[in-house]
């Protein structure tokens, strides 16, 4: 049960809802966006004010952390199980410090299992946040400070901070260090979406959201 099902059951107000793992009674709290683009979006990541530390362990990224009403990571295990049940789209919404907004929409998104390091799979990019995907293609394994699965002889998660699908290390990291306004440029370990804002620009806010493709 995801936010799309919650929406279809008549709950059309933004807020925190209790979702369940597929084929399980295990529950998880998530923020549902019931307004943007028709609603039914399950928010899997949000950055907005730097209130939550995203330099977390593999286990924390697996089960999730933070507060669904603010900054949080929903959890790789739930997202993996959900996105392997049916086809999902991923929308990434970005805000810079100058009042601009942009998005990247992937028409097919899923995460592999933990055994395969929650590798990200993406197809069909559209949107305003760059014609080239800032998540390296083909998708990479997830890496954290204690789980180094990147393609660099360095340790991307330690260099750039945060857990992400690092390449070597690649053009994005939405889980990097949060830098406030006027401290957000020329930061090499910030919140980055290269093919929108280029190098060293750390974003003001990000949201990653998923929804069934047939919603």
């Amino acid at each position: 049960r995801d936010c799309a099902e919650v929406f279809k059951s008549g709950h059309t107000t933004n807020g925190i809802y209790t979702l369940t793992f597929p084929n399980s009674t295990e529950e998880i709290k998530a923020y549902c966006d019931m307004e943007a683009g028709g609603g039914g979006w399950t928010i899997i990541q949000r950055r907005e004010d730097g209130s939550v530390d995203f330099q977390r362990t593999w286990k924390e990224y697996k089960v999730g952390f933070g507060n669904p009403s603010g900054e949080y990571w929903l959890g790789n295990e739930f997202v993996s199980q959900l996105t392997n049940q049916q086809r999902y789209v991923l929308k990434i919404h970005l805000k810079d410090w100058e009042g601009n907004e942009a998005y990247s929409l992937y028409e097919h998104f899923y995460l592999s299992s933990e055994e395969l390091n929650y590798r990200i799979h993406l197809k069909g990019l559209t949107g305003t946040a760059g014609k080239i995907s800032s998540i390296s293609q083909p998708g990479n394994d997830f890496s954290t400070k204690d789980g180094d699965n990147d393609k660099c002889i360095c340790k991307c998660s330690q260099m750039l901070t945060g857990g992400w699908w690092f390449d070597a290390c690649g053009p994005s990291n939405l889980n990097g260090m949060y830098y406030p306004q006027r401290q957000n440029t020329n930061k090499f370990n910030g919140i980055k979406w290269y093919y929108w804002k280029g190098s060293g620009y750390s974003l003001k806010a990000t949201t990653m959201m998923i929804r069934p493709a047939d919603f």
């Epitope: 002889i153 340790k155 390449d167 690649g170 090499f188 290269y194 093919y195 190098s199 060293g200």
Partner: antibody, heavy 121, light 107 residues
Framework: QVQLVQSGVEVKKPGASVKVSCKTS????????FSWVRQAPGQGLEWLGW????????NYAQKFQGRVTMTTDTSTSTAYMELRTLRSDDTAVYYC??????????????WGQGTLVTVAS | DIQMTQSPSSVSASVGDRVIITCRAS??????LAWYQQKPGTAPKLLIH???SLQTGVPSRFSGSGSGTEFALTINSLQPEDFGTYYC?????????FGGGTRVEIK
Amino acid sequence: QVQLVQSGVEVKKPGASVKVSCKTSGYTFSNNGFSWVRQAPGQGLEWLGWISGYNGNTNYAQKFQGRVTMTTDTSTSTAYMELRTLRSDDTAVYYCARDQDYSNFHWLDPWGQGTLVTVAS
Amino acid sequence: DIQMTQSPSSVSASVGDRVIITCRASQGLSSWLAWYQQKPGTAPKLLIHSASSLQTGVPSRFSGSGSGTEFALTINSLQPEDFGTYYCQQANSFPLTFGGGTRVEIK
């Protein structure tokens, strides 16, 4: 393989300007940035500034602000560095060097062969 | 700006010796440090990045260590072709800055 080929030796008079080019091949130009570094005779390495091959963003060392301009031409995969109001102490070998801009990695590899700029009246 | 201080400024060693060059940063760099080798009349060559990651094609006798403000480049079993000047460079923030260099001479 990746190559950076710079323009040839320049001899300039004080007060003049010089524009050095750095033509690249063997990789995706827009994924990388360029630093320009100079080395006066018998001295160490001095960083002048950086430009993104993706969007042309620049960052100049304060010492050269207002006197240096870095540009790129994506159609020819070439980076340029212009230094104005030359003085005799600008005599140096000027290097361009590539970095992994898209990864925010600003270590430099490879380097161009260098361009000797001599400023003398 | 981040100041980089290298020592020693020069070293003379015999083939087979171990040479250690240190680099101190005026503020913490995490692992954002690179080492270069430059031979007379040629451009610098990247040896090590991320403080300890050996660049492809660089002999394994070169190694880097350290994090924060203290770093070291070690050449194990110095070879005749290792002469030249070695520079550290911080890549933590703009402006990029280099150490003053360490000249390595073969006895």
